[in-house]
Interface confidence: low
Amino acid sequence: GVFNYEAETPSVIPAARLFKSYVLDGDKLIPKVAPQVISSVENVGGNGGPGTIKNITFAEGIPFKFVKERVDEVDNANFKYNYTVIEGDVLGDKLEKVSHELKIVAAPGGGSIVKISSKFHAKGYHEVNAEKMKGAKEMAEKLLRAVESYLLAHTAEYN
């Protein structure tokens, strides 16, 4: 079955700057600002557009080793980024894949809202643990906060 999970996270960073850093340059920036979570992101095929495959290696102390993601859509004009987790111990034995649709929208006061809509594709009739879905959201939030902190400390970058 398919289990949906939606989350919204407020950010003080304007949408365009956040998309440019967190999404478009995330492969380089995230391991730099959150080394305690992600140790490396390696592009193993593609130019960053749809079809690109990335290997993400988690840091020591994180209960997962690696994840393989496929880029499904990149919409620079509307700050949309869709990708699918297709491999990795994060999926366990009950999940076939997890598809994420990320959209960053402008918010009052100059900030933005990061909206994530996730579809957890379970194998057969397996249920998806709510904790697993919540855990994915919390990890994404940690990475977002780290990127925000970096952007505030380095005001000249990603403008």
Partner: antibody
Framework: EVQLVESGGGLVQPGGSLRLSCTAS????????MSWVRQAPGKGLEWVSN????????NYVESVKGRFTISRDNAKNSLYLQINSLRGEDTAVYYC??????????????????WGQGTTVTVSS | DIVMTQSPLSLPVTPGEPASISCRSS???????????LDWYLQKPGQSPQLLIY???NRASGVPDRFSGSGSGTEFTLKISRVEAEDVGIYYC?????????FGGGTKVEIK
């Protein structure tokens, strides 16, 4: 693991000085404002001071102005609090905390989200 | 300085039952960006404080969803939908709109 570890506390006579240190691990403290918060024995929490990422902006509670100085060494991932002219009412556990506050942006605030275990300062003759 | 006032001072609770703590500020904590700069912290016995809620209603990472924050302006509330034994400790509200940041006096939550 993201953590903060304080040190430098101890027993000091009134009028004396101490330098408290706070070392961050698991994250780059240079990306964050940092705060000191204290708690007198059996009392509530009192925010003491905070410092901007690059050290250019510092804030203090009125009762410590002119006696306490906050500073940081980003290369060492460390935060400091120099406390001079100590008084009995400065006796407390001193906590450092990661402070996601930024007065310059106005909007950026996500709470004091990581705290150390605290270091105890006792002022007594 | 902004003065924060919490009530009650002490709150005896029964596990499984709801609980509510109020916090009032001496001036509005509503920023022009529409966010209320009000946090809730829990200090468990013998431990450092931990962040529960920031900007009035946003749960911090890892905080169980039985905790919720609400309110705007000068009146704020922390609710625990079903109290668990591990929730005992002292709860503090804190304003972060202006320095000096200021805390409420605390509410001690204990099991009946």
């Amino acid at each position: 693991e993201v953590q903060l570890v304080e040190s430098g506390g101890g027993l000091v006579q009134p009028g004396g000085s101490l330098r408290l240190s706070c070392t961050a691990s698991g994250f780059m403290s240079s990306m964050y404002w940092m705060s000191w918060v204290r708690q007198a024995p059996g009392k509530g929490l009192e925010w003491v001071s905070n410092i901007k990422q690059d050290g250019t902006e510092k804030n203090y509670v009125e009762s410590v102005k002119g006696r306490f100085t906050i500073s940081r060494d980003n290369a060492k991932n460390s935060l400091y609090l120099q406390i001079n002219s100590l008084r009995g009412e400065d006796t407390a556990v001193y906590y450092c905390a990661r402070d996601l506050y930024s007065s310059s942006s106005g909007y950026y605030y996500y709470g004091l989200d990581v705290w150390g275990q605290g270091t105890t300062v006792t002022v007594s003759s | 300085d902004i003065v924060m006032t919490q009530s009650p001072l002490s709150l005896p609770v029964t596990p499984g039952e709801p609980a509510s703590i109020s916090c009032r500020s001496s001036q509005s904590l509503l920023h022009s960006n529409k966010y209320n700069y009000l946090d809730w912290y829990l200090q468990k016995p013998g431990q450092s404080p931990q962040l529960l809620i920031y900007l009035s209603s946003n749960r911090a990472s890892g905080v169980p969803d039985r905790f919720s924050g609400s309110g705007s302006g000068t009146e704020f509330t922390l609710k625990i939908s079903r109290v668990e034994a591990e929730d005992v400790g002292i709860y503090y509200c804190m304003q972060a709109l202006h320095t000096p940041l200021t805390f409420g006096g605390g509410t001690k939550v204990e099991i009946k």
